[in-house]
Interface confidence: medium
């Protein structure tokens, strides 16, 4: 089946620094979502993109509009509360109903 490759699997940042998470898709995707997992294990939706970029505070997400084969999540001025696990998920263009998840990025922000 279609696959989502998320990188890096783990990331340590110092408070106040910037970084980016990336997801590569083995086929063209119709849309992409970025989530953050809360302490109870529930997923909080950060972004939903069908193309282009979206920004929310210190977070910015982009989805390659041409090839539709990758997406990035940029974190600016990382704060301690940004620590957690981030997931991307993509919806296949085939319309077969499947949302396919990346394996997650464990982000640790250090003081």
């Amino acid at each position: 089946g279609d696959q989502v490759e998320q990188s890096p699997s783990a990331l340590s940042l110092h408070e106040g620094t910037d970084s980016a998470l990336r997801c590569n898709f083995t086929t063209t995707m119709r849309s992409v979502q970025w989530f953050r997992q809360n302490s109870r294990g529930s997923l909080i939706s950060l972004f939903y993109l069908a193309s282009g970029t979206k920004e929310n505070g210190r977070l910015k997400s982009a989805f390659d509009s041409k090839e539709r084969r990758y997406s990035t999540l940029h974190i600016r001025d990382a704060q301690l509360e940004d620590s957690g696990t981030y997931f991307c998920a993509a919806e296949a263009s085939s319309g077969s109903w499947q949302l396919i998840f990346g394996s997650g990025t464990q982000l640790t922000v250090m003081p």
Partner: antibody, heavy 113, light 106 residues
Framework: QVQLQESGAGLVKPGASVKLSCTAS????????MHWVKQRPEQGLEWIGR????????KYDPKFQGKATITADTSSNTAYLQLSSLTSEDTAVYYC??????WGQGTTVTVSS | DIELTQSPAIMSASPGEKVTITCSAS?????MYWYQQKSDASPKLWIY???NLAPGVPARFSGSGSGNSYSLTISSMEGEDAATYYC?????????FGGGTKLEIK
């Protein structure tokens, strides 16, 4: 947050039609596919079909062809399921879903005279 | 249509017990998806692509299988696992579901 809210059900008479709506928030339905699933009381799940709201293309399980009609209105960000010639077999909870992650809470149709 | 048969239809397990639910396909499928549904709630994606746990699903769950035979396993049953589990195939339209397995806690 992505949310799907179904409405439009209730008690309907045999032979009548009903139109269920599924209003989306947190995303544009034209960027995805919208699906409908049926669940009869104490029974399993049945995929009815889906629509590509960007162009109106639909795909159905053949057993729901003629019974179900899926449409969408991108201006109101809403997908619809119309069920015709209702019988007791159509008594069920109907769910709309985006991909297989985001599901509505379900809406109940009860067919009874 | 590809028919999916789940077994058992109903089962109960004690806390700590290992649980296996099987899903048998009438034709070979490429992979299987699993959902958990609790009473009066919408189904939740639980396992995708046969063996990948959806985010937030406890590690005691696992999925395996190929061809015509797939399974969902709980290594050590917990009270919160009591629910109905459905398998679903995406190999051939229409996307069919299994009849469900109702798992109860003893």
């Amino acid at each position: 947050q992505v949310q799907l809210q179904e409405s439009g059900a209730g008690l309907v008479k045999p032979g009548a039609s009903v139109k269920l709506s599924c209003t989306a928030s947190g995303f544009n339905i034209k960027d995805t596919y919208m699906h409908w699933v049926k669940q009869r009381p104490e029974q399993g799940l049945e995929w009815i079909g889906r629509i590509d709201p960007a162009n109106g293309n639909t795909k159905y399980d053949p057993k729901f062809q003629g019974k179900a009609t899926i449409t969408a209105d991108t201006s109101s960000n809403t997908a619809y399921l119309q069920l015709s010639s209702l019988t007791s077999e159509d008594t069920a909870v109907y769910y709309c879903a985006r991909a297989n992650w985001d599901w509505g809470q379900g809406t109940t149709v009860t067919v009874s005279s | 249509d590809i028919e999916l048969t789940q077994s058992p239809a109903i089962m109960s397990a004690s806390p700590g017990e290992k649980v296996t639910i099987t899903c048998s396909a009438s034709s070979s499928v490429n992979y299987m998806y699993w959902y958990q549904q609790k009473s009066d709630a919408s189904p939740k994606l639980w396992i995708y692509y046969t063996s990948n746990l959806a985010p937030g699903v406890p590690a005691r769950f696992s999925g395996s299988g190929s061809g015509n035979s797939y399974s969902l396993t709980i290594s050590s049953m917990e009270g919160e696992d009591a629910a109905t589990y459905y398998c679903q195939q995406f190999t051939s339209s229409p996307w069919t579901f299994g009849g469900g397995t109702k798992l109860e806690i003893k």
